[in-house]
Amino acid sequence: EEELQVIQPDKSVSVAAGESAILHCTVTSLIPVGPIQWFRGAGPARELIYNQKEGHFPRVTTVSESTKRENMDFSISISNITPADAGTYYCVKFRKGSPDTEFKSGAGTELSVRAKPSAPVVSGPAARATPQHTVSFTCESHGFSPRDITLKWFKNGNELSDFQTNVDPVGESVSYSIHSTAKVVLTREDVHSQVICEVAHVTLQGDPLRGTANLSETIRVPPTLEVTQQPVRAENQVNVTCQVRKFYPQRLQLTWLENGNVSRTETASTVTENKDGTYNWMSWLLVNVSAHRDDVKLTCQVEHDGQPAVSKSHDLKVSAHPKEQGSNTAAENTGSNERGSSDYKDDDDKHHHHHH
């Protein structure tokens, strides 16, 4: 009789995570009597995967009925494969004894696990940046195997080229992670823009995973200010407007100053949105010129998104309205020369208030 051989026909087997792996093993003889054991790895640190004689192996089932006579097929199926199961598996014949002793090993089957990368997570800078600045975005994806992976960056569908990518670890591992940093130059039109990180891997069957970041969370477009004097609305009143244009995000506080003194502070609420995603807002100041004997310097001061205030001033010539110079008004008596729309009862005045 020829000596027993342990045949593992597959040098390698590749399985998707979550599936079952079938590891084939046959022996060429019924002699010697003794059990089969499966190990992952070789040498003293090898890990027992299945022992025909004894033990509890909930994830392992035998492919054929090992109790049946003349059975020489000791293939096993391992359920719910994870990347941690990767390695070389050996089918080993033991000889009956006290204890059973190792008789012969198969050549081994290398199990590789195809694991999908996690959904890419794109994160931008902690603080907002303004147009013309370069900001960095990172993209991370984890848990994939094998190591080969492709990562691309896009801005509004246009592929970016300024990025650096690392796959870790460098050596052999059960699974891998990818980390990429892309540099993006912001423009004033980027409020509606998206940065996309796209990951392609053998497990995704040509349908890459994408992670996105909205530049609306990254960009700050500072406003432009324009202060103008409207025609006289009443004999003793001048309407001064401050147009705040093309800003983002909406968080904005406006303060009117008369000759450097705070006259009114308000927060942008009802704004108009431009096509590019930026906002416009307008504030009115009604100045009672009869309360002033000298020229008035009106300043529109805007604090946008917690940034240092920007301002625009306008000089109001009181001398242009001599009729009103000496008149007494309630405003003068109260020391107030500006009114918000809430101070007015008629719809026309409300309509001309700063909330548009």
């Epitope: 019924l30 002699i31 003794g34 004689k53 109790t67 006579r69 003349e70």
Partner: antibody, heavy 119, light 110 residues
Framework: QVQLVQSGAEVKKPGASVKVSCKAS????????INWVRQAPGQGLEWIAM????????HYNQIFKDRATLTTDTSTSTAYMELRSLRSDDTAVYYC????????????WGRGTLVTVSS | DIVLTQSPDSLAVSLGERATINCRAS??????????IFWYQQKPGQPPKLLIY???NLDPGVPDRFSGSGSGTDFTLTISSLQAEDVAVYYC????????FGQGTKLEIK
Amino acid sequence: QVQLVQSGAEVKKPGASVKVSCKASGYTFTNYWINWVRQAPGQGLEWIAMIDPSDSETHYNQIFKDRATLTTDTSTSTAYMELRSLRSDDTAVYYCAMDYGSLYAMDYWGRGTLVTVSS
Amino acid sequence: DIVLTQSPDSLAVSLGERATINCRASKSVSSSGYNYIFWYQQKPGQPPKLLIYLASNLDPGVPDRFSGSGSGTDFTLTISSLQAEDVAVYYCQHSRELPTFGQGTKLEIK
């Protein structure tokens, strides 16, 4: 190591039934056949039947087919052999034996259970 | 059923001498290149012990003075140099079909 521990001696009257147990340890009970063999005093070995605990497949010696029933309890790794309609010539030592090579042989044996049938 | 017939029924051999026990099957016990014959030793008050499996393979732990041979229908158990502890009854068994035992051979010291 493999151990098969059998239940104690029984004395039965003719016509009665006996159920002998065999508790296995030291191996995975469902992976190997259990055989039952008997030996009358001063006589040779007589094979009764065998059972595969994994699926309760059984094979019986025709002589015992109508009177013997093999069962297993995998939760306790115990095999049972019940013999009905006992006669005096059923007096024997009843052995359970484990087949380690799936060759329908008997590699490891219990110590035996003496069943005496006497009126 | 396959019937196994052992010969002799009893045998007396001097210590250190060769002992030979035969087992003949009523039909071939070979299958797939294997001879499904097994030999057991039983000492008084003890269960049988497997000595030889598949006609010629020594069970682990069995002294190598025991050997088995034969094929088809005729098989032999040989003890090359009898020792005192070898006194026992020896049985052959087949499993080509459902198992049966030979009637046994009693081995004594001459």
